[in-house]
Interface confidence: low
Amino acid sequence: SQVSQNCHNGSYEISVLMMDNSAFAEPLENVEDAVNEGLEIVRGRLQNAGLNVTVNASFMYSDGLIHNSGDCRSSTCEGLDLLRKISNAKRMGCVLMGPSCTYSTFQMYLDTELSYPMISAGSFGLSCDYKETLTRLMSPARKLTYFLVNFWKTNDLPFKTYSWSTSYVYKNGTESEDCFWYLNALEASVSYFSHELSFKLVLRQDKEFQDILMDHNRKSNVIVMCGGPEFLYKLKGDRAVAEDIVIILVDLFNDQYFEDNVTAPDYMKNVLVLTQSPGNSLLNSSFSRNLSPTKRDFALAYLNGILLFGHMLKTFLENGENITTPKFAHAFRNLTFEGYDGPVTLDDWGDVDSTMVLLYTSVDTKKYKVLLTYDTHVNQTNPVDMSPTFTWKNSKLPNDITDRGPQ
């Protein structure tokens, strides 16, 4: 049966899937508020452009009957459930916002002909790469693998003079949705990361990880894991760590490292943290202690999704183009729009680009300091601290294989 799009004659709607299974445990009313705040900004921008149109959101709530675990691992059917609701209501907006779970998004793509754009705050997995009408507003796993390969190969920086080609990956299956798919991408034998490494082993048990820290026969000095400092401490505690071990802690959606009064705990000295730049407006601010950084990023992605919808609406209306065409559905990529925190760039496949930041713990100040930044848009590493006060010998990152001799 034909679903009519509420997307013409001066009235434009975005359908927002409100799913109990979401990438981050954010109350749905907060997501709704983020959407509404975004709509207000969009209305103002359209009005300023002289476009006298109505913009609204319709919220589609799932009943959670089939899938009540509340996490993304049980979300495969939920997106389709909601699509069925839309189909029964015979009403659809110009754009679909959601779902955020990789399983849901993948399944919806598999089972439906999506002739309208879909915007997701999540869908991190490789299986959601290269989808022609999907836009992802939080860094997908593919971007992480590009950074890691780029960084592994780098050997011409004062603090990194060896190319690396080996790694351990710690993945115990209890990770958050973003970490689950980031590590999944590193584990997958077909991924870019696996393809470029000569040795990679996934550690699945706490004991495996703990043993590697002092194992003289280890095959790599580098361990990649995902989560926050507390997660690492639970695993590592105050155990001794060999001096040439480097732990890469992926913690993209966490601004706590940039707080003025944060001191790095001692167990972080062998760790490089990969996070994202919180933006200029936030770098100099004093964060309150009760900041919930992941929720901030998730809600911000929803708000930016609405702003993206507004941007595309404005562009098409100003050019006198039809909104309900395949051209509109495929247009949400290869562009920059004004997000809530500044410009947001989407790549050729509709995935958000960002500045990733690699931090180290200064042995002098016990503060997190920026070692380098990485621009995902141009796949380029930019060193920031040319003389880092590392814990590692000679203030240089060690070779990834101990005593391999000169290269």
Partner: nanobody, 133 residues
């Protein structure tokens, strides 16, 4: 820290109008909202009106239809137009700013004057409004 300075208070007769202003300076970053609060003698501070960055206004029931909050982002100034003033409006009026540092910075419900937690908010020194015949 944002520096907020209120002005426009004074003594006024019931039924008359008054306009308060609040000039913000210093680091403002990305804010959730700004608002006006008041504290009558011997009472707790209460929300009067708030306005989000995009201009959505919310009012306490006691002032709805009488007070109007507005802002001029280019001048970094907040206003409160108070009409049909009553004796019970007598209080010290404070300007406040809730910034993105707040945990739920994206939740405009948090910005409603009835629900706004007072933690993580920057305050002005206050300006006194006395409604008396």
């Amino acid at each position: 820290q944002v520096h907020l300075v209120e002005s426009g208070g004074g003594v006024v007769q019931p039924g008359r109008s008054l306009r308060l202003s609040c000039a913000a300076s210093g680091y403002t970053g990305r804010r959730l909202c700004r608002g006006w609060f008041r504290q009558a003698p011997g009472k707790e501070r209460e929300g009067v009106a708030t306005i989000t960055l995009s201009g959505r206004a919310s009012y306490a029931d006691s002032v709805k239809g009488r007070f109007t909050i507005s802002q001029d982002n280019s001048k970094n100034t907040l206003y409160l137009q108070m009409n049909s003033l009553r004796a019970e409006d007598t209080a010290v009026y404070f300007c406040a700013e809730v910034r993105s540092a707040d945990a739920e910075w994206l939740n405009p419900l948090k910005c409603h004057p009835d629900r706004l937690g007072l933690a993580g908010v920057d305050w002005g020194q206050g300006t006194t409004v006395t409604v008396s015949s």
